[in-house]
């Protein structure tokens, strides 16, 4: 109509899928009576009557909106429930009196896509590919309208780049009218991309504004040939015999090449291949000094039949040889002197020390131990320890027994044993001397003798307690080429008043004699050994 004003832009109403859209008829009272309104939907420029308002009462027209429309706000607003993407169109209300006017509303529908699902190319990408290869696929399901996708590498957005980066996106419409977006990132990767983190981001709009959702980060397997091969040894630092040592071959290629580890044979100048475990690791357990030498790793790239060699690695397994002491079995007269010398070989500087076996007392720091004016008590064990101070735990020891010539010494001079008549008693008698003594008993019984060490002997006698034995007691006699000595065991009958122990007796009804508190020798002068020599 000439002179008629241009049609105003429709009012915009934004709503999320599934919610209710409130379509407020914006006609003023002068433009029409809101108690008499027709509502239309416009789709592809075709208008369809969907709702009538008469005298303030609403009535749906048959069709797709029949069940979802209702009047609100005293008839001025039409409520559309369960909004779908198909509802994105223009709705208009038309007043009937005083003259026909219409008010247009553009309904915009939104739906956030689901979390983007990213799938990395499981086959991986070789770095030498001539064109961009598929890195990952991003899928954003059930969004409306179509979301925008942005790809990121290490937190930076990726742009299309000829022959380097290509992003291929497509979308499908679900029966619900929602869109599923699929985006494929193709790229030419380099070796440094082996640790690169890729993710996709979906940008979408809701009535509340712009939003985005990010996928998880993924890394793509990147394949590149090995350029460098090297060996690593664990543990790092000084190695010693007995350690568990792992020699591992490493390469900078992916996938790792086939490895072999070889040890140089100094006599043949050939590298002899060692047996590795399934992971290509050579395990030396326990490590021995023979494992020392030059190791190298060979790696084969089976794609090209190119073989690569590592730099050789020198392995040193530190050791201490068997310790030798001279003289090996020393024998000396009382009052004489003795020099003990200790020797050993090692891959490192050695420290020696001499210890008394019985007490662990350090007697000398150094390989030579000198003993003067030897007494009977000096007999026994001396231990040489050869150690490498720079490597804790690397040491070897050798024990030598010194024998001092002399008549037998008895473990005790006399002792009281509590007994019951007619019991079988187990008596023991201990003596030492050099040459080693033998022990005899003055009563009949079953005797057995055992060596405690080269200079010491223990004899055990099983005997029946008789009245005669109670009267005489029992004697044991130790003898060697240099003399003899005797110990006496007094037998006492047990009664309730004799159960209190004293320092020179053995208590209880045990069939074995307890160890002595003192040692005595029954020659004319009685000597007591120093406490450390006690066998208590």
């Amino acid at each position: 109509v000439p002179g008629e004003a241009e049609q105003p832009a429709p009012e915009l109403v934004e709503v999320e899928v599934g919610s209710t859209a409130l379509l407020k008829c914006g006609l003023s009272q002068s433009q029409g009576n809101l108690s008499h309104v027709d509502w239309f939907s416009v789709h592809k420029e075709k208008r369809t009557l969907i709702f009538r308002v008469r005298q303030g009462q609403g009535q749906s027209e048959p069709g797709e909106y029949e069940q979802r429309l209702s009047l609100q706000d005293r008839g001025a607003t039409l409520a559309l429930t369960q909004v779908t993407p198909q509802d994105e169109r223009i709705f208009l209300c038309q007043g009937k009196r005083p003259r026909s006017q219409e008010y247009r509303i553009q309904l915009r529908v939104y739906k956030a896509p689901e979390e983007p699902n990213i799938q990395v190319n499981p086959l991986g990408i070789p770095v030498n590919s001539k064109e961009p290869e598929e890195v990952a696929t991003c899928v954003g399901r059930n969004g409306y309208p179509i979301p925008q996708v942005i790809w990121y590498k290490n937190g930076r957005p990726l742009k299309e780049e000829k022959n380097r980066v290509h992003i291929q996106s497509s979308q499908t419409v679900e029966s619900s009218g929602l869109y599923t977006l699929q985006s494929i990132l193709k790229a030419q990767l380099v070796k440094e991309d082996k640790d690169a983190q890729f993710y996709c981001e979906l940008n979408y709009r809701l009535p509340s504004g712009n939003h985005m959702k990010e996928s998880r980060e993924v890394t793509v397997p990147v394949f590149y040939p090995t350029e460098k091969v090297w060996l690593e040894v664990e543990p790092v630092g000084m190695l010693k015999e007995g350690d568990r040592v792992e020699i591992r071959c490493l390469a900078d290629g992916n996938p790792p090449p086939h490895f072999s580890i070889s040890k140089g044979n100094p006599s043949t100048r050939e590298a002899e291949e060692e047996t590795t475990n399934d992971n290509g690791v050579l395990v030396l357990e326990p490590a021995r000094k023979e494992h020392s030498g030059r190791y190298e790793c060979q790696a084969w790239n089976l794609d090209t039949m190119i073989s690569l060699l590592s730099e050789p690695q020198e392995l040193l397994v530190n050791y201490v040889s068997d310790v030798r002491v001279s003289p090996a079995a020393p024998e000396r007269q009382e009052g004489s002197s003795l020099t003990l010398t200790c020797e050993a070989e090692s891959s490192q500087d050695l420290e020696f020390q001499w210890l008394r076996e019985e007490t662990d007392q350090v007697l000398e720091r150094g390989p030579v131990l000198q003993l003067h004016d030897l007494k009977r008590e000096a007999g026994g064990g001396y231990r040489c320890v050869a150690s490498v101070p720079s490597i804790p735990g690397l040491n070897r020891t050798q024990l030598v027994k010194l024998a001092i010539f002399g008549p037998p010494w008895m473990a005790f001079k006399e002792r009281k044993v509590w007994v019951k008549e007619n019991m079988v008693l187990n008596l023991s008698c201990e003596a030492s001397g050099h040459p080693r003594p033998t022990i005899s008993w003055n009563v009949n019984g079953t005797a057995s003798e055992g060596d405690q060490d080269p200079q010491r002997v223990l004899s055990t006698l099983n005997v029946l307690v008789t009245p005669e034995l109670l009267e005489t007691g029992v004697e044991c006699t130790a003898s060697n080429d240099l003399g003899k000595n005797t110990s006496i065991l007094f037998l006492e009958l047990v009664n309730l008043t004799t159960l209190t122990p004293d320092s020179n007796t053995t208590t209880g009804l045990s069939t074995s004699t307890a160890s002595p508190h003192t040692r005595a020798n029954s020659t004319s002068t009685e000597r007591k050994l120093p406490e450390p020599e006690s066998r208590g």
Epitope: V127, S129, S260, A271, D303, T304, M305, I306, L309
Partner: antibody
Framework: EVQLVESGGGLVQPGGSLRLSCAAS????????MSWVRQAPGKGLEWVAT????????YYPDSVKGRFTISRDNAKNSLYLQMNSLRAEDTAVYYC?????????????WGQGTMVTVSS | DIVMTQSPDSLAVSLGERATINCKSS????????????LAWYQQKPGQPPKLLIY???TRESGVPDRFTGSGSGTDFTLTISSLQAEDVAVYYC????????FGQGTKVEIK
Amino acid sequence: EVQLVESGGGLVQPGGSLRLSCAASGFTFSSYIMSWVRQAPGKGLEWVATISSGGSSTYYPDSVKGRFTISRDNAKNSLYLQMNSLRAEDTAVYYCTRDDDYDVKVFAYWGQGTMVTVSS
Amino acid sequence: DIVMTQSPDSLAVSLGERATINCKSSRSLLNSRIRKNYLAWYQQKPGQPPKLLIYWASTRESGVPDRFTGSGSGTDFTLTISSLQAEDVAVYYCKQSYNLLTFGQGTKVEIK
């Protein structure tokens, strides 16, 4: 019959670039490892580059690493050598070679070679 | 890198006589597991590309006459032509493939 025909050689100034090609026939090109070997005038042989059958693995000696790139197009039965930052010492006859099916690296078949001269 | 040294640099031998070329490696080329040496020999006649003669140090390539024999192990290798023929005039190269690939400098064989 296995045939390897090199092309692309010529005169180039120091610092310049050149791309050599090798057309292969008489065998299934995509199944074989290929290499380039060169020979300076009056001198011995020097290995230059190797590429796996699928093209994913490449190897070079230190003398050309970072300057030369070996590639292949299996659809075209062709092998290439892109040579950049050329030097006078790169002057040589360049041979295209094919490996054989042995478990060892050998150059079983050779082309006739193409001459590359680097000179100002 | 492995250095390959050939000796002599050149060799003049009468027809029908034996020719011996030596090749020495700066390190062993023997793979002790498979007991094979990563060494090959090539022949290059004047104006022609090289030709593979021997691989694994002693395995003759098919079609190569049996007068050509490769021997040796570890670091010392030999190519022997038992009875030199006129067509054997060429430069002979050894090549290692134990660590990347390197050729010897070549030995020229001529007729005396």
